[in-house]
Interface confidence: low
């Protein structure tokens, strides 16, 4: 069974998938569609790297542009380095400015909904 066929079989169960499953899926050439991606748990999407999301979505990665103001895409963008987002060529804005450090302060993030940044 190839990646696409496997994805079709598990698609209906993906809404609650944890980050680990999404990372594994990104290695299987599944080409997840945007509608499915938008239904994923925000907390599962946030830890994914730009490269992992690109692999997970395949040709559908371009759909991120249309969804950049909606969750979970909006929140995921806020967690990515702008440099990394730029490699997608989508014109996605709102990433962590180049030269900033990301402090993984869980309480701060839980309160504000965004990562704590230290300036250059």
């Amino acid at each position: 069974m190839n990646g696409s066929e496997y994805f079709v079989k598990i698609q209906s169960f993906l809404g609650g998938a944890p980050t680990e499953d999404l990372k594994a899926l990104s290695q299987q050439n599944v080409s997840m569609d945007l509608a499915t991606f938008m239904k994923l748990r925000t907390d599962a999407v946030l830890p994914l790297t730009v490269a992992e999301v690109q692999k997970l979505l395949g040709p559908h990665v371009e759909g991120l542009k249309a969804e950049e103001r909606h969750r979970p895409v909006r929140d995921w963008i806020l967690r990515q380095r702008q440099d990394d987002l730029d490699t997608l060529g989508l014109g996605l804005q709102g990433g962590i400015p180049n030269g900033y450090l990301v402090l993984d302060l869980s309480m701060q993030e839980a309160l504000s909904g965004t990562p704590c940044l230290l300036g250059p």
């Epitope: 080409s31 997608l88 989508l90």
Partner: antibody
Framework: QVQLQQPGTELVKPGASVKLSCKAS????????MHWVKQRPGQGLEWIGN????????NYNEKFKNKATLTVDKSSSTADMQLNSLTSEDSAVYYC?????????????WGQGTLVTVSG | DIVMTQSQKFMSTSVGDRVSVTCKAS??????IAWYQQKPGQSPKALIY???YRYSGVPDRFTGSGSGTDFTLTITNVQSEDLAEYFC?????????FGGGTKVEIK
């Protein structure tokens, strides 16, 4: 005005390699994937793969993984495709076609194509 | 890989008539389909994206329809300049794949 310059013809010997170029102008080179498509005389179109000029990342059709290597030179806005170990099966027209990530993924623009003839 | 099948290799029509070129995908591709026109000795030209949206500059006699696995490109009021080969292409998943093409001939 989007323009894609490809050399008209390349005559190569069996077993040799050839590097095809596609010089782009009229748009932001790093904002567009560059795709390559093969068309044998009187036959259909085959997608070879694409390359992201921002980071050099690429996707290949499995069939061409050991045949084609896609690269870019950002400084000259040129995409290259190297074909190795050429045989008569590789005699074809090769097109480059950019597509803006974040927009519709059909190929609105095509190069004029390079006719590669493999002949001893 | 997703196989795109254009079962009719040739179609014959007359100026002013209507012709429908069909394309079938081996699995569901939603509306992630494009159509191209290729005239002899020329590069392909994009006509339709997302199954039914015309590229700018494409005459409105070209219309695309369908979703899932079955797609149609319809040319109404066929003109002599429509003599060409027409290809469908899916961009739902890698590798991107094309149909084998349908040549439209003018009687």
């Amino acid at each position: 005005q989007v323009q894609l310059q490809q050399p008209g013809t390349e005559l190569v010997k069996p077993g040799a390699s050839v590097k095809l170029s596609c010089k782009a102008s009229g748009y932001t080179f790093t904002s567009y994937w560059m795709h390559w498509v093969k068309q044998r005389p009187g036959q259909g179109l085959e997608w070879i793969g694409n390359v992201n000029p921002s980071n050099g990342g690429s996707n290949y059709n499995e069939k061409f993984k050991n045949k084609a290597t896609l690269t870019v030179d950002k400084s000259s806005s040129t995409a290259d495709m190297q074909l190795n170990s050429l045989t008569s099966e590789d005699s074809a027209v090769y097109y480059c076609a950019p597509h803006y990530i974040g927009s519709r993924p059909g190929f609105a623009y095509w190069g004029q194509g390079t006719l590669v003839t493999v002949s001893g | 890989d997703i196989v795109m099948t254009q079962s009719q290799k040739f179609m014959s029509t007359s100026v002013g008539d209507r012709v429908s070129v069909t394309c079938k995908a081996s699995q569901n591709v939603g509306t992630n389909i494009a159509w191209y026109q290729q005239k002899p000795g020329q590069s392909p030209k994009a006509l339709i994206y997302s199954a039914s949206y015309r590229y700018s500059g494409v005459p409105d006699r070209f219309t695309g329809s369908g979703s899932g696995t079955d797609f149609t490109l319809t040319i109404t009021n066929v003109q002599s300049e429509d003599l060409a080969e027409y290809f469908c292409q899916q961009y739902n998943s890698y590798p991107l794949t094309f149909g084998g093409g349908t040549k439209v001939e003018i009687k």
